[in-house]
């Protein structure tokens, strides 16, 4: 393990659509992936008239958007489905929404992340 980084080996699992997807509804998911690649946890949810409905929680493959995030926080402004990812065992047990101020989209595609 690399010092200062929390490795993700398992995440909270939840699937609201478990019957259709033929999975368990809830539990703990061991995270698998290519050797040397990082692993993360994620949570997705909807906000239906102020009521939070969890859609899915589980393991997420190596993603630079999730690096060094110990907390699962959605920063996009009013997405249709909220998504957050994080590093560390079961880090997706809690999740939150803190939208960043949106900057006007540049005329060409940014390769770097959109600035806050």
């Amino acid at each position: 393990a690399i010092l200062g980084r929390s490795e993700t080996q398992e995440c909270l699992f939840f699937n609201a659509n478990w019957e259709k997807d033929r999975t368990n509804q809830t539990g703990v998911e061991p995270c698998y992936g290519d050797k040397d690649k990082r692993r993360h946890c994620f949570a997705t949810w909807k906000n239906i008239s102020g009521s939070i409905e969890i859609v899915k929680q589980g393991c997420w493959l190596d993603d630079i958007n999730c690096y060094d995030r110990t907390d699962c926080v959605e920063k996009k402004d009013s997405p249709e489905v909220y998504f957050c990812c994080c590093e560390g065992n079961m880090c997706n047990e809690k999740f939150s929404y803190f939208p960043e101020m949106e900057v006007t989209q540049p005329t060409s595609n940014p390769v770097t992340p959109k600035p806050p």
Epitope: K56, D63, I64, F83, V111, T112, P113, K114
Partner: antibody, heavy 115, light 111 residues
Framework: QVQLVQSGAEVKKPGASVKVSCKAS????????INWVRQAPGQGLEWMGT????????SYAQKFQGRVTMTRDTSISTAYMELSRLRSDDTAVYYC????????WGQGTLVTVSS | QSALTQPASVSGSPGQSITISCTGT?????????VNWYQQHPGKAPKLMIY???KQQSGVSNRFSGSKSGNTASLTISGLQAEDEADYYC???????????FGGGTKLTVL
């Protein structure tokens, strides 16, 4: 093992639409992104866009904005890329690839646009 | 975002080492360790060789290595073999807040 299997070759007329599918197996489909890339005959790779397989959130290259739609059906672990208002210069092999690193690729789908 | 810049072609003899460059800007290649390298044989799908500038994809020969200096990423192939003859592309991570872009590709000829 991880596999992405794409739908078969298509021949379309200018102005029509095409929908290419990409069926994933060997990993949890909802654990990453699916990216779409195309390659015109004798040309390089061109990124079209990406879809978050669990949330359905998409990002499209500006060039394709308004003409491309990426969707997925998590119950059958399949991603879709639909390109509308086809032109002859859309003739290309279209690839899907797993994750932001493009670590596994589909075999490609040849789309020919010809009148 | 304009494509990353690669040489159109490079060549080398069996056993030699070759390096392919991929030049971007201070806001993409220069700022982040997220450049990848792909190998593509004619009529085949691309294959990830190096990701995150210098990490080897599982199952890839250790003759392939990646590095970065300033705004330029490089792929080095040592002990060149006939089967290394292919097109090589650099590209960036794409997903979430990141948009993808590829280099124009480099044709490697093994003499």
């Amino acid at each position: 093992q991880v596999q992405l299997v794409q739908s078969g070759a298509e021949v379309k007329k200018p102005g029509a639409s095409v929908k290419v599918s990409c069926k994933a197996s060997g990993y949890t489909f909802t654990s990453s992104y699916i990216n779409w890339v195309r390659q015109a005959p004798g040309q390089g790779l061109e990124w079209m866009g990406t879809i978050n397989a669990v949330s359905g959130s998409t990002s499209y290259a500006q060039k394709f904005q308004g003409r491309v739609t990426m969707t997925r059906d998590t119950s059958i672990s399949t991603a879709y890329m639909e390109l509308s208002r086809l032109r002859s210069d859309d003739t290309a092999v279209y690839y899907c690839a797993r994750s932001g690193w493009f670590d596994y690729w589909g075999q490609g789908t040849l789309v020919t646009v010809s009148s | 975002q304009s494509a990353l810049t690669q040489p159109a072609s490079v060549s080398g003899s069996p056993g030699q080492s070759i390096t392919i460059s991929c030049t971007g800007t201070s806001s993409d290649v220069g700022s982040y360790n997220y450049v990848n390298w792909y190998q593509q044989h004619p009529g085949k799908a691309p294959k990830l060789m190096i990701y995150g500038v210098s990490k080897q994809q599982s199952g890839v020969s250790n003759r392939f290595s990646g590095s970065k200096s300033g705004n330029t990423a490089s792929l080095t192939i040592s002990g060149l073999q006939a089967e290394d003859e292919a097109d090589y592309y650099c590209g960036t991570f794409a997903g979430g807040s990141y948009y993808g872009v590829f280099g124009g590709g480099t044709k490697l000829t093994v003499l």
